[in-house]
């Protein structure tokens, strides 16, 4: 099938032959992601992914992380990754556990961005970053 | 640390019950989301609501409860469920339970803690 | 809707004998998986989180393991106090308002 780079009922072209994002939106292994340049709170950027059909990035694999890191113009971006304080332990925003590291940690820093260094960044929740949303492509 | 409900009892079909948990050597924090569950007799568990125990007081609810069931924190210690139209099948014992939860933002984990319940009996 | 399917309902064991119980998850849980001991009158305790991280208190005879859909726990060295009832259930949260889904049951019945 013909793959366009314009439509006209909102998507865009991807990298997977009848597999499309909508306009704007990023693809990647399956999986649709937008990268906001307006900021927010942690909790407004969680709405603000809800109310596009999808959710905060959950970036559990190292290959999605620098498909990420390349496209984030050095900037911050909150995912979907929060401290369980309780817990002492990191989880997605799905519950599953996160194992690895989390840099400028911090007790008032629960929430976590990445894009400006290489890494993933404890940030405060309450900070407004940009966003990455993420859900499947059609 | 310890969770008990009361306001159990016998209803009438299409009555309405105000189930209420009491936790004791803890307060209703920012750590924890408060729960519903129920159980049959002889049966499964069946998740209802929680609600987060922090300022926000952020709840969320099993798609079959949306509109019967209402869960609320009325006071630091204290938690409840307002049931409406009760069916038979609404007849299990109501259990409350703990959950951790992260620093307020929807998501919530295992159950921890678990009172003993109270059972709900609808019948004419 | 996400379902936990739960096997076997009933399993007898001997004192000093092993049973395993399984929960398959209708989808991907990513390790999301709590299990739970129910003796009759009582409440539910938590034995097990994150598929395999033991509860506080809980004895190391209880193990948990699996990923993706497939998840097991392994009560080795039975002692008669292990019968009771043993549920899964997981804590993945796709978006949906189903959360918290419970498998059906298991009764471990020691001889």
């Known amino acids: 099938p013909q793959i366009f780079n314009k439509s006209n009922d909102g998507f865009t072209t991807t990298r997977s032959y009848g597999t499309v994002c909508p306009k704007d939106w990023e693809f990647y292994q399956a999986r649709c992601f937008f990268l906001s340049t307006s900021e927010s709170s942690w909790n407004e950027s969680r709405d603000f992914c809800k109310g596009k059909g999808s959710t905060l990035a959950i970036v559990n694999t190292p290959e999605k992380l620098k498909f990420l890191q390349d496209i984030t113009d050095a900037e911050k971006y909150f995912i979907g990754l929060i401290y369980h304080r309780e817990e002492k332990r990191w989880r997605w925003i799905n519950n599953s556990v996160f194992n690895g590291n989390v840099t400028n940690q911090n007790q008032n820093f629960n929430c976590a961005t990445i894009g400006l260094t290489k890494t993933f960044d404890a940030a405060s929740c309450d900070i407004s970053y940009r966003r990455i949303c993420e859900k499947n492509a059609k | 640390q310890s969770l008990e409900e009361s306001g159990g009892g016998l209803v009438k079909p299409e009555g309405s019950l105000t189930l209420t948990c009491k936790a004791s050597?803890?307060?209703?924090?920012?750590?924890?989301?408060m729960c519903w569950v129920r159980q049959a007799p002889g049966k499964g568990l069946e998740w209802i609501a929680c609600i987060y125990a922090g300022s926000s007081g952020t709840t969320v609810y099993a798609s079959w409860a949306k509109g019967r069931f209402t869960i609320s924190k009325t006071s630091s210690t204290t938690v409840t469920l307002q049931m409406t139209s009760l069916t038979a099948a609404d007849t299990a014992t109501y259990l409350c339970?703990?959950?951790?939860?992260?620093?307020?933002?929807?998501?919530?984990?295992?159950?921890?803690?678990w009172g003993p319940g109270t059972l709900v009996t609808v019948s004419s | 809707a996400l379902v936990m399917t739960q096997t076997p309902s009933s399993v007898s064991a001997a004192v000093g004998g092993t049973v395993t119980i399984k929960c398959q998850a209708s989808q991907n849980i990513y390790s999301t998986l709590a299990w739970y001991q129910q003796k009759p009158g009582q409440p539910p305790k938590l034995l097990m989180f994150?598929?395999?991280d033991l509860a506080s208190g809980v004895p190391s005879r209880f193990k948990g393991s699996g990923s993706g859909t497939e998840y097991t726990l392994t009560i080795s060295d039975l002692e008669p106090a292990d019968a009771a009832t043993y549920f899964c259930?997981?804590?993945?949260?796709?978006?949906?308002?189903?959360?918290?889904?419970f498998g059906g049951g298991t009764e471990v019945v020691v001889k």
């Open positions: 339970a703990r959950k951790l939860g992260d620093v307020g933002y929807g998501h919530t984990t295992y159950f921890n803690l």
């Open positions: 050597g803890f307060t209703l924090s920012s750590y924890y989301y």
């Open positions: 259930q997981t804590y993945y949260d796709s978006g949906s308002d189903d959360l918290n889904a």
């Open positions: 994150d598929a395999s």
